[in-house]
């Protein structure tokens, strides 16, 4: 079954292709399901679900998230604004989907189809986005000793920021499905 | 477990903050909802609040009713009570096992508001 | 906003029934189905349209897609009086209430 795609929707050739909006939905939501995966493995193979300690790791990342300012909340809410934020947000976290490629044993694939997919969520939105000059692309240097700083931690660090790479890209796709669904 | 407190007689106009507590878990990880029922009569939902600090609030609630959150309790302030505002009010967790539905899967027993002059 | 249907319904001991719930644009499957007795918070029973929540008996049976979902029970026992309710979780925007009317089960 192809990303985002239900098998019931598949069996029926009769029904209307989807809209930008209904894709978009759907693969946000199939990237979901991945996330929920990765950190089912996660928080069985350590407690760092249960943990208390994540802010030690939280001072070394710099994940995006979502605030009122953005205008994606239903207070103030700025299409405009919030989707030059929700492109600006998934491109920044591309590295850490790029850490997360050798970080799972069983779950390697579905690991490799949440970095796939989300390159094709960030195509599918940017097509969407009237302000393409608003959306700062990350550097790639930062980016790269970024990737090998976050190599070099012990491996407590590393489970640790597994769990909070996963977590936080959970909610800012939550938040984003949110928003997209009042545009 | 959820607990909700603060719930009483009031008198119309009278602003109202009722408090859910949680025990055994931390509020700051799942989302958060209250919801009402008038005696009798079915679930009307009043609001979340996400994980992401976000508000989102029924159309007839907006503007009178504020909920907000710390890792232990969420509160829900309300102003400018009527009796058509008498009902029982729970608050109730969402789920997180699955990444995006927002199903309530624990509830608390509920607290009771009166509004009457 | 979510219609459900019938408001009240009566059962014979062992019979099935089956409330339906509507919404006014597709949800995507994302609607839970809550059981609430007089006096009780609800309680959640099935989720995502059809998966049972933890410890809910089998005889509980959720289906649809788009904007049509349905809730069925069958082999209904005494316990199964209770009124019951359907919830979209697709959207929190621009919405009256996430809950349908709710649905009387009385069982003879």
């Known amino acids: 079954v192809p990303p985002g795609e239900d098998s019931k929707d598949v069996a029926a050739p009769h029904r209307q292709p989807l809209t930008s909006s209904e894709r978009i939905d759907k693969q946000i939501r199939y990237i979901l399901d991945g996330i929920s995966a990765l950190r089912k493995e996660t928080c069985n193979k350590s407690n760092m679900c249960e943990s208390s300690k994540e802010a030690l790791a939280e001072n070394n990342l710099n994940l995006p998230k979502m605030a009122e300012k953005d205008g994606c909340f239903q207070s103030g809410f700025n299409e405009e604004t919030c989707l030059v934020k929700i492109i600006t947000g998934l491109l920044e976290f591309e590295v850490y989907l790029e850490y997360l490629q050798n970080r799972f044993e069983s779950s390697e694939e579905q690991a490799r189809a949440v970095q796939m997919s989300t390159k094709v969520l960030i195509q599918f939105l940017q097509k969407k986005a009237k302000n393409l000059d608003a959306i700062t692309t990350p550097d790639p240097t930062t980016n790269a000793s970024l990737l090998t700083k976050l190599q070099a931690q012990n491996q407590w660090l590393q489970d640790m920021t597994t769990h909070l790479i996963l977590r936080s890209f959970k909610e800012f796709l939550q938040s984003s499905l949110r928003a997209l669904r009042q545009m | 477990s959820l607990e909700e407190s603060g719930g009483r007689l009031v008198t119309p106009g009278t602003p109202l903050t009722l408090t859910c507590t949680a025990s055994?878990?931390?509020?700051?990880?799942?989302?958060m909802s209250w919801v009402r029922q008038a005696p009798g009569k079915g679930l009307e939902w009043i609001g979340y609040?996400?994980?992401?600090?976000s508000t989102y609030y029924a159309n007839w609630a907006k503007g009178r009713f504020s909920i907000s959150k710390t890792s232990t309790t969420v509160d829900l302030k309300m102003t400018s009570l009527t009796a058509e505002d008498t009902a029982t009010y729970f608050c109730?967790?969402?789920?997180?096992?699955?990444?995006?539905?927002?199903?309530?899967?624990?509830w608390g027993p509920g607290t009771l508001v009166t509004v009457s002059s | 906003d979510m219609t459900q249907t019938p408001a009240s319904v009566e059962v014979a001991m062992g019979g099935t029934v089956t409330i339906k719930c509507q919404a006014s644009?597709?949800?995507?499957?994302?609607l839970s189905w809550y059981q609430q007795k007089p006096g009780q918070p609800p309680k959640l029973l099935i989720y995502?349209?059809?998966t049972l929540a933890s410890g809910v008996s089998s005889r509980f049976k959720g289906s649809g897609s788009g904007t049509e979902y349905t809730l069925t029970i069958s082999g209904v026992e005494c316990a199964d009086a209770a009124t019951y309710y359907c919830?979209?979780?697709?959207?929190?925007?621009?919405?009256?209430?996430?809950f349908g009317g709710g649905t009387e089960v009385v069982v003879k």
């Open positions: 109730a967790k969402g789920s997180t096992d699955y990444a995006f539905d927002t199903r309530l899967d624990l």
């Open positions: 055994g878990f931390s509020l700051s990880s799942y989302d």
């Open positions: 609040i996400y994980t992401d600090t």
């Open positions: 644009q597709s949800i995507s499957n994302e």
């Open positions: 995502r349209t059809s």
């Open positions: 919830q979209q979780g697709y959207n929190s925007n621009d919405v009256d209430n996430v």
